[in-house]
Every structure is written in structure tokens, then in C-alpha cells.
């Protein structure tokens, strides 16, 4: 089976790499525009230059193209704790990231939020905090992991998953409760 190609891909595949087919005349291959520029006018004929113009401030193209407009620069989302790592240039989009001792949590492919790395209080660091992953903690005896924090087993209720880790303490609490009944 032949894979289905979009119209643009079909048109481009007729021309050699770095060129695209003229939209009004499919016998002409025009040179694509360099990154940092966009297509202002198609080349008038074979071997003639494509009219490419530099992207205006606030816009970019990151690869060779025949786009009629540059792409708008991304803005870092302050409400998500994001900070600007590098500003937008004509050939590169803004790069957003997190502050030191924070990690990115991706809610979706193109949306991340910055959170503080866990310190593993009442536990030890099993895996250090990374750019896209929180610290992995191992809790000391008498503590269990809840929302990546080591919480005292005295906060473990029988209905929760912590009962296996906190079994001796749970039995203790149960015994105390039983002895208090009449």
C-alpha cells in the first residue's frame, strides 16, 4: 500500500530537496526560504530567486520553509511558574523552563507546570530531581509516601494503601482503640 501523502508533501516530493513546486506552475521548482525568513513571493521562473523576507520581531521560522507568514513566538506561562530560558529569535522559538530546584510536569504535550522538587524529609533520596521528574523518595520506617512526601504512619487509615507499609503501627492503633472500649 502506498502511504497517503498530503497535497503539500506530494507537491514537494516532485522537486529536489531544498526546493518546492510553484503553486501556479508545477513545472517550476523554487528554492525554499532559509530559517529566519518566510516566503514573500514565489520564484518567477526556473533558476530564478524566491523572494524571502526576514521574520519580523515576535515571530520566527526554525527550518527552511515556504510559509507565507512566520510563526508567532511562544510566551512563557507565568501562571504555570514558567521562566524564560532563552528569548525568541528570528530562527528559534522562545525556550521556557523552570527555576532551580523545580521540575516540569506535563499536563499535556504542550503544557507544563513547574513544581518544587521534593526534599524527602523523613526519608532518603532514591533518585534525584530531574528536569521532567520529581525526586523519588524512600521513606524511613514509620513513614509512608503520600503525594511524594513521607507522612507519619499515625496518619494511615485502614482504608488507604499505606496499611501494608504501616502494618505494625496500624495493629498498634487498633489494639489501643480496642482496649479503650467497654
Amino acid at each position: 500500500l502506498v502511504p497517503h501523502l498530503g497535497d503539500r508533501e506530494k507537491r514537494d516530493s516532485v522537486c529536489p530537496q531544498g526546493k518546492y513546486i510553484h503553486p501556479q506552475n508545477n513545472s517550476i521548482c523554487c528554492t525554499k526560504c532559509h530559517k529566519g525568513t518566510y516566503l514573500y513571493n514565489d520564484c518567477p521562473g526556473p533558476g530564478q530567486d524566491t523572494d524571502c523576507r526576514e521574520c519580523e520581531s515576535g515571530s520566527f521560522t526554525a527550518s527552511e520553509n515556504h510559509l507565507r507568514h512566520c510563526l508567532s513566538c511562544s510566551k512563557c506561562r507565568k501562571e504555570m511558574g514558567q521562566v524564560e530560558i532563552s528569548s525568541c529569535t528570528v530562527d528559534r522559538d522562545t525556550v521556557c523552563g523552570c527555576r532551580k530546584n523545580q521540575y516540569r510536569h506535563y499536563w499535556s504535550e504542550n503544557l507544563f507546570q513547574c513544581f518544587n522538587c521534593s526534599l524527602c524529609l523523613n526519608g532518603t533520596v532514591h533518585l534525584s530531581c530531574q528536569e521532567k521528574q520529581n525526586t523519588v523518595c524512600t521513606c524511613h520506617a514509620g513513614f509512608f509516601l503520600r503525594e511524594n512526601e513521607c507522612v507519619s504512619c499515625s496518619n494511615c487509615k485502614k482504608s488507604l494503601e499505606c496499611t501494608k507499609l504501616c502494618l505494625p503501627q496500624i495493629e498498634n492503633v487498633k489494639g489501643t482503640e480496642d482496649s479503650g472500649t467497654t
Epitope: 507565568k78 501562571e79 510536569h105 507546570q113 513544581f115 520529581n134
Partner: nanobody, 119 residues
């Protein structure tokens, strides 16, 4: 105590519109970025949209961009989601929530309102 109460869901035909509301109490609503998330049957939570404290910065998932509009009225402590051109794939329970602060989980979210898009 933080309370979030969604309303406005229901059965709607494809192409139709609905407006969801979320009444907030127990915290300073005007100080919080607010979020709409949804959960389709048998699926995980999907981030739909969010709006910053003053209603200036908004975000929309690609799947709803151009069809849904998030807004808020800080004087009424209410968050809204205007849903137009509804599709079968928008069928889900919609929840409003405060933007998480401590980690990637929702400490405060409502009980949800069911939106069913079907002919």
C-alpha cells in the same frame, strides 16, 4: 472549607452549545488561577482550559481550541466554560479546579457535571 460546584451539563446534540458554570467558595477566588479538566468514560483526566487570576491569560487544549471559551467573574466567584460546536468526543464529566500548587494533583476540585453529546 474550599467548595467548587459545577452546573450546566446535560444531553446535547452534536453541533450544539452549552455553558458550564462553577461556583466557588471558601477561598479567595480572585487570587487563584482556575482550571477546567474533563474525564471521558474509561479515560484519564484531560486538561481542557485554564484562566489566570485576572482573566488575562488563557490556555486551551488543541482539541477544544476555537470552540470553547473560558471566562470568570471575580465579583460573583464564578468560573465559566462556553462550549460551542460540540462533538461526540466532548462527552465527559467536566470538573473545575484550583490550579495545583504543591504537586501534580488536584487538592481542590468539584464533583463534576456530565456533558453528553449525542444525536
Amino acid at each position: 472549607e474550599v467548595q467548587l460546584m459545577e452546573s450546566g451539563g446535560g444531553l446535547i446534540q452534536p453541533g450544539g452549545s452549552l455553558r458550564l458554570s462553577c461556583a466557588a467558595s471558601g477561598f479567595t477566588f480572585a487570587h487563584e488561577t482556575m482550571v477546567w479538566v474533563r474525564q471521558a468514560p474509561g479515560k484519564g483526566l484531560e486538561w481542557v482550559s485554564h484562566i489566570d487570576r485576572v482573566g488575562q491569560d488563557t490556555y486551551y487544549a488543541d482539541s477544544v481550541k476555537g470552540r470553547f471559551t473560558i471566562s470568570r467573574d471575580n465579583s460573583k466567584n464564578t468560573l465559566y466554560l462556553q462550549m460551542n460546536s460540540l462533538r461526540a468526543e466532548d462527552t465527559a464529566v467536566y470538573y473545575c479546579a484550583e490550579l495545583p500548587k504543591r504537586g501534580p494533583w488536584f487538592d481542590h476540585r468539584g464533583q463534576g457535571t456530565l456533558v453528553t453529546v449525542s444525536s
